[in-house]
Structures are given as structure tokens and as C-alpha cells.
Interface confidence: low
């Protein structure tokens, strides 16, 4: 027999199948051109000294063989003696070491057995009712296919699944979606309705993330507020990387988890933008305001669970930066200005009500005045800081108020609102004899003392009613007692106390009359 034709004789070996586990398998035959055909197969086991014979039986019952030697692939034409228009049965017999091993048979019409391509190009992946939907363009001239998929996770081996018959210009497959692990999928196709025809190769891997992106396990730290009024937010611990199946390691698209940082500035609620989202790599500078920081993990199916942290406000206060002048028309604050065209946010909140929303006001962009100061004024009618209580004031600045990460803290301080002069007047002034020429004056702390840094000092005034001589005694803001010495017995005195702030002289308390009794010797 010639080498290019199927030999209608008995093969040159005994045809008993040894039934071993090794041998030829996965035979597939298909048309490769208008008149050309190819069969190929796998051989399991040692290949030394193995001779392969492709066997073919026609529908008439006549059988022939091609001897391929050690090759596991054979090409032949429609002139090789094998009927290509009618059903034939093909198998491989491999002869080695006086044994013959036989592959499973395939029965097909060679002319109709076209080698199908796997899904090519872009395989679109989406989520549909808790399942995974894959969709792709049907390869040219190959409408009508059976499709299979196989999938694996990082810890499991391949599992086979069926996509069902396809008969359109686009093909699709519903596959299982894992909640918490990434998967690798591959797809293959074969001609619809020809069970004996061969499967295409497997497609390139399709890498699919878990339905839920992993919870971002990260930790933050925030630096001290710098002299520029900003502090750096730093990432202490990177998010853990998702474990990937073998074919998805390396630059496999589709399984990426992106982490984004969502900043919510809780302070200064009247500003234009409260929330800003940044890539996690872009660790921002923050003002001294309070923030909520969320890390959002997203994959191709959208955002997943997020983790939120609260960054408390930096409450370090500046004792001297703010000047406040109270006039008949209202109140004006002055502080060292930032650059040209800066917007300021002035926020105030009664001390002890930190849980509630602060009140604030956004200034128009302003330039420094000739003295290098910025100002904010309000009238008494506005009601701003109008109650006689302690307020915490924070001033933030930005040349770009809409960009959340460009705010900085100018100062943080306290202010006593309303008529601080009157409200701060010390009460319960009492005088006690101390010695023959001195008395001890005590008073209840001023309301101003509840406001850190506001009370500059107490002043105690003593007037000699006989001579009208007045002496004033400054007292530290932490003290509520003073001793008046060098007093004369029998003289009437009045004593008053006032509480002063850095910008305001307090109102005197009610005069308290006293005298030191003249000591009569026995």
C-alpha cells in the first residue's frame, strides 16, 4: 500500500487490545481544506518503539489503515480511499513491545467535521442573577456550536461544565460565580449535532474575581498637624492581595481589585464639597478637621464592602492667633492671613456639644489686609455666637475650596459668646479677715474660666472710702482668691472683682463693703 492512501489489508500485527491504561486517546478528525483532512491523537505512555495505525471502517463494513510510524498526526486527501461524504468509524491502534493498544472510536462524516475555533477575542463577563454570564462573538462561519467550560479556583482542580447549544452570531454561557474566591475559566466549542466531532482547543483564560471584593484590611495613621495646618494620612498596612488561580497569575485582566480612599470632612459643613474619593496610593494631606475615611474595594462587578475609620479633629489650640473686637455694631475676628484669594471657613460650636453639627460660615475669597490679616465680621442680629457660653472656634483655609484635600487649619481656639463682659463677672465675692491689717477676698470662678485660654486674668479693686484711694491687684486666671494687705482698721473699704479676656475688659462685680475692726487693748 502507498503511504498516502488507506490500505485495505490486515495490519501487520495481532489486533488484540491489551486493555492497559496507557495508549492512544483523544482522537479527533476534521476537514482542514476543501479536500484535505487531518486526524490527531494523544499517546499516553513511553513512546520508544511505538508504531501507530489509524484504522477506518466504512459503512459497507470494509476497513483499512494508515501507518503513521511514531507520528500522532496524519493528513490525507479525499482521494485516500476513505469516504468523506458518508459516516465512517475511526480509531487508533498503537503497537509496541508485541502489544496492541486501542483508542476509543469516533464515528463521523469527515466532510462535515470542521475544526471549530474556541471563543476568540474579547469575552465579556457580567453578573446575572447571582451567576456569571460570558458572551463572545461567534467565530466566522461557525454558527451552531456546542460549548463547554472548565473552571478552577486557587485551591481546586478543573471542573467541567456545559453551556448548552448555541445558534447565533453571539454565543453566551452561564457559569457559577464564587462569592469569595477568584476563578479561571476556559471555553471550547464543537460543531452542533455531531457528537463524534472534535472539540476546539481551550480558549485563553478568562479570569473572574469573586462576587464580593475582599474586605480591605488596612490601617491608617495620621501625623501631627504641621505648621502649615495640614497633617499627612499614611497607610500602615497594605490591603491583602487576592489569591489567584494558576492561569490568572501575572498580568491577567479581570480579577484586579482596586482600592479607593473616600474622605468625608465632617468639620465645616457649609463648604462646597464634603466628600472626595482618591486612589489608595494617593495618601492625602488633611487639615486638622475631623474626617471619616472609608476604603472602598471594587472589582469588575462594582464596589464591595468598605471599611470606615474616624479621624478625630486635632484639638490643639493656638492661644494668641485670633483677635476679636466687639463693637456696638457687631463682632470682628482678625487672624494672620494666608495667601491671596483664600477662602476661609469659620466654624463654631458650643463646648460640650461636640456631637452635634457645628455652625459655620464660608467667606468669599479674600486677600490679606495691609496688616497681613484676614477678617470675618458678624452683626449681633445674626445670632452668631450670641449665647453667653463658651464656643470652640476653628478656622480653615483653602485657595481651592472645592478640593477637599487642599483645606488646612489656620487656627483652633475658644471664644466666649454674647455679652462676655457681663456674663464673665465673678459672683459670690466674699471678704474674710485674715490678720490685723489684711483680708482674704474669695469669689466663684467666672463663667469665662470654662473657656480654655479665654480668661486672661482677674482684677481685684479695693477702694478706701475715706480717701477714695483705689488699688488694683491682678490675679492669675486659675486663682479665685487674693489677700489684700496694709489695710487700716476702722476704715471702710469696698472690693470688686472683674474677669478680663485678651480682647475685652470685664464688668466689675457688685461692690462689697468691709472694714477691719479697731482692736481695743484690755
Amino acid at each position: 500500500c502507498g503511504t498516502s492512501e488507506c490500505c485495505f489489508q490486515d495490519p501487520p500485527y495481532s489486533d488484540a487490545d491489551s486493555g492497559s491504561a496507557s495508549g492512544p486517546r483523544d482522537l479527533s478528525c476534521y476537514r482542514i481544506s476543501s479536500a484535505g483532512y487531518e486526524c490527531s491523537w494523544q499517546y499516553e505512555g513511553p513512546t520508544a518503539g511505538v508504531s501507530h495505525f489509524l484504522r477506518c471502517c466504512l459503512s459497507s463494513g470494509r476497513c483499512c489503515y494508515f501507518a503513521t510510524g511514531s507520528a500522532t498526526r496524519l493528513q490525507f486527501s479525499d482521494q485516500a480511499g476513505v469516504s468523506v461524504l458518508h459516516t465512517v468509524t475511526l480509531w487508533v491502534e498503537s503497537w509496541a513491545r508485541n502489544r496492541t493498544e486501542k483508542s476509543p472510536e469516533v464515528t463521523l462524516q469527515l466532510y462535515k467535521s470542521v475544526k471549530y475555533k474556541p471563543p476568540l477575542g474579547d469575552i465579556k463577563v457580567s453578573k446575572l442573577a447571582g451567576q456569571l454570564r460570558m458572551e463572545w462573538e461567534t467565530p466566522d462561519n461557525q454558527v451552531g456550536a456546542e460549548v463547554q467550560f472548565r473552571h478552577r479556583t486557587p485551591s481546586s482542580s478543573w471542573k467541567l461544565g456545559d453551556c448548552g447549544p448555541q445558534d447565533d452570531d453571539t454565543e453566551s454561557c452561564l457559569c457559577p460565580l464564587e462569592m469569595n474566591v477568584a476563578q479561571e475559566f476556559q471555553l471550547r466549542r464543537r460543531r452542533l449535532g455531531s457528537q463524534g466531532s472534535s472539540w476546539s482547543k481551550w480558549s485563553s483564560p478568562v479570569c473572574v474575581p469573586p462576587e464580593n471584593p475582599p474586605q480591605p484590611q488596612v490601617r491608617f495613621s495620621v501625623e501631627q498637624l504641621g505648621r502649615d495646618g495640614r497633617r499627612r494620612l499614611t497607610l500602615k498596612e497594605q490591603p491583602t492581595q487576592l489569591e489567584l488561580p494558576e492561569g490568572c497569575q501575572g498580568p491577567a485582566p479581570g480579577v484586579e481589585v482596586t482600592y479607593q480612599l473616600q474622605l468625608h470632612m465632617l468639620s465645616c459643613p457649609c463648604k462646597a464639597k464634603a466628600t472626595r474619593t482618591l486612589p489608595l496610593e494617593k495618601m492625602p494631606y488633611l487639615s486638622g478637621a475631623a474626617y471619616n475615611v472609608a476604603v472602598i474595594s471594587s472589582n469588575r462587578f462594582g464596589p464591595g464592602p468598605n471599611q470606615t475609620w474616624h479621624i478625630p479633629a486635632d484639638t490643639h489650640t493656638e492661644p494668641v492667633a485670633l483677635n476679636i473686637s466687639v463693637g456696638t455694631n457687631g463682632t470682628t475676628m482678625y487672624w494672620p492671613a494666608r495667601a491671596q484669594s483664600t477662602t476661609y471657613c469659620i466654624e463654631w460650636q458650643p463646648v460640650g456639644q461636640e456631637g452635634s453639627l457645628a455652625t459655620c460660615n464660608l467667606t468669599a475669597p479674600q486677600d490679606p489686609d495691609p496688616a497681613g490679616m484676614a477678617t470675618y465680621s458678624w452683626s449681633r442680629e445674626s445670632g452668631a455666637m450670641g449665647q453667653e457660653k463658651c464656643y470652640h472656634i476653628t478656622i480653615f483655609a483653602s485657595a481651592h475650596p472645592k478640593k477637599l484635600t487642599l483645606w488646612s487649619t489656620v487656627l483652633s481656639t475658644y471664644h466666649f459668646g454674647g455679652n462676655a463682659s457681663a456674663a464673665g463677672t465673678p459672683h459670690h465675692v466674699s471678704v474674710k479677715n485674715h490678720s490685723l491689717d489684711s483680708v482674704s477676698v474669695d469669689w466663684a470662678p467666672s463663667l469665662l474660666s470654662t473657656c480654655p485660654g479665654v480668661l486672661k486674668e482677674y482684677v481685684v479693686r479695693c477702694r478706701d472710702e475715706d480717701s477714695n484711694q483705689v488699688s488694683e491687684h491682678p490675679v492669675q486666671p486659675t486663682e479665685t482668691q487674693v489677700t489684700l494687705s496694709d489695710l487700716r482698721a476702722g476704715v471702710a473699704y469696698t472690693v470688686q472683682v472683674r474677669a478680663d479676656t485678651a480682647w475685652l475688659r470685664g464688668a466689675w462685680s457688685q461692690p462689697q463693703r468691709f472694714s477691719i475692726k479697731v482692736q481695743v487693748s484690755d
Epitope: A272, K273, G302, A399, K402
Partner: antibody, heavy 121, light 107 residues
């Protein structure tokens, strides 16, 4: 690849309504702010409205405030523009455009091909 | 609303020329400015964002500069495919506004 496909345009009489849609694909729609920008025939570009990734923030041009409503359906990857009380000066090609961030404080990195709205009696 | 004024409104140039288009904002907008290219019948294409950052995929012959109120788009060596209309856009404050456009034509 990122694709934005507008639909819903057509000829409409003054005073009537029209709803434009923009179908988004090729990116995680839920992670981006979106806007509508229009261009009257032979004229320049005009920003119409914008919406943040989660619809918590919507903004409008003064010329359409109170008449147009921007919205999104993240489950359908679709952006909408509901246009009521249409006027002749609303005649334009309407483009759907993506912001490169969750919010809309930025330029627009991807645009659709546009859909023509003609308001005429 | 912030007004954006582009100049010139049109210009004629030859392949290889250096072309400069300016955009002025009616108030300071920091660097919140984008430049777009639009060809007839097509959607605009982002070239520059944040006044000077080149959008990925855009040739390096395009560059942007400026901050505050005055901005410039420069094409270092004009190519045949660069003949189009160019727009600037501010995104500093709502409503976002575009310049009226600069048409770059073949000389």
C-alpha cells in the same frame, strides 16, 4: 473598551418632554461621575448636568435648572436626562460624558457619539 | 457663571508649525482646566486635564500650561490630523463652562 451610547433623541414640539438614555459598558459604571454636554448646530459645547457615582450629588447649568433632571440606574449601567418644558434653544446634539472620578469635579475623559434633539413646532 | 474666553477664534497654520491657543477665565480657577479636540461630526476628545497633565494616549506634541486665570494649549509641531476645533473647559465651579472654541485650519 469604554463605550457610551446615547439614545432617545428626536424631533419634539416646544413645551413637550423627552428622555435621553446613555448605556455605558466597558468600565465599572458605579465608580464614575457622569455628565450631559450639548452642542447646538454650528455652536460650541455647553455642560448641561452632572451626577456623582452614587447619585448623591447632582448639578445643573442655569439654563436647564428646574426643567431637566439627571439620574442614573447603576443596576442597568445607564444614565438618563429627563427633559421637560423643552424650548427651541434646547435643540442640540446631546453627549453623555464620563468623569475620571467618583465625583464630577473634573474634565470628561470619555464621550458618547451623541444623540440629536430637535425642538420645533 | 465663570466665563471662559478663547483666542484666537480661528487660525490658519501649516504642518510642522508651532501653534498656541490661549484661554482666559473670568476669575481664578486654580488649575481646574481641561482642553479638548473636536473634529466635525465627532465627539470631543480629552487632551489635557488639570491645566498641564497629558491624557494617556495623547501625543506628546500637545502640552498645556497656566494656572489661575490664564492658560495655554501648545501644539509643538502641527500634524495633518491636528486640524480641528479646540475647546477649553473649567471645572472649578458649577456650572462648568467651555470656551467658545478655536478652529485650527490648513493654511
Amino acid at each position: 473598551q469604554v463605550q457610551l451610547v446615547e439614545s432617545g433623541g428626536g424631533v419634539v414640539q416646544p413645551g413637550r418632554s423627552l428622555r435621553l438614555s446613555c448605556a455605558a459598558s466597558g468600565f465599572t459604571f458605579t465608580s464614575y461621575g457622569m455628565s450631559w454636554v450639548r452642542q447646538a448646530p454650528g455652536k460650541g459645547l455647553e455642560w448641561v448636568a452632572g451626577i456623582s457615582y452614587d447619585a448623591s450629588d447632582t448639578e445643573y447649568a442655569d439654563s436647564v435648572k428646574g426643567r431637566f433632571t439627571i439620574s442614573r440606574d447603576n443596576s442597568k449601567n445607564t444614565l438618563y436626562l429627563q427633559m421637560n418644558s423643552l424650548r427651541a434653544e434646547d435643540t442640540a446634539v446631546y453627549y453623555c460624558a464620563r468623569s475620571p472620578d467618583y465625583i464630577i469635579d473634573y474634565g470628561f475623559d470619555y464621550w458618547g457619539r451623541g444623540t440629536l434633539v430637535t425642538v420645533s413646532s | 457663571a465663570i466665563q471662559m474666553t478663547q483666542s484666537p477664534s480661528s487660525l490658519s497654520a501649516s504642518v510642522g508649525d508651532r501653534v498656541t491657543i490661549t484661554c482666559r477665565a473670568s476669575q481664578g480657577i486654580s488649575s481646574d482646566l481641561a482642553w479638548y479636540q473636536q473634529k466635525p461630526g465627532k465627539a470631543p476628545k480629552l487632551l489635557i486635564y488639570d491645566a498641564s497633565s497629558l491624557q494617556s494616549g495623547v501625543p506628546s506634541r500637545f502640552s498645556g500650561s497656566g494656572s489661575g486665570t490664564d492658560f495655554t494649549l501648545t501644539i509643538s509641531s502641527l500634524q495633518p490630523e491636528d486640524f480641528a476645533t479646540y475647546y477649553c473647559q473649567q471645572y472649578w465651579w458649577y456650572p462648568f463652562t467651555f470656551g467658545q472654541g478655536t478652529k485650527v485650519e490648513i493654511k
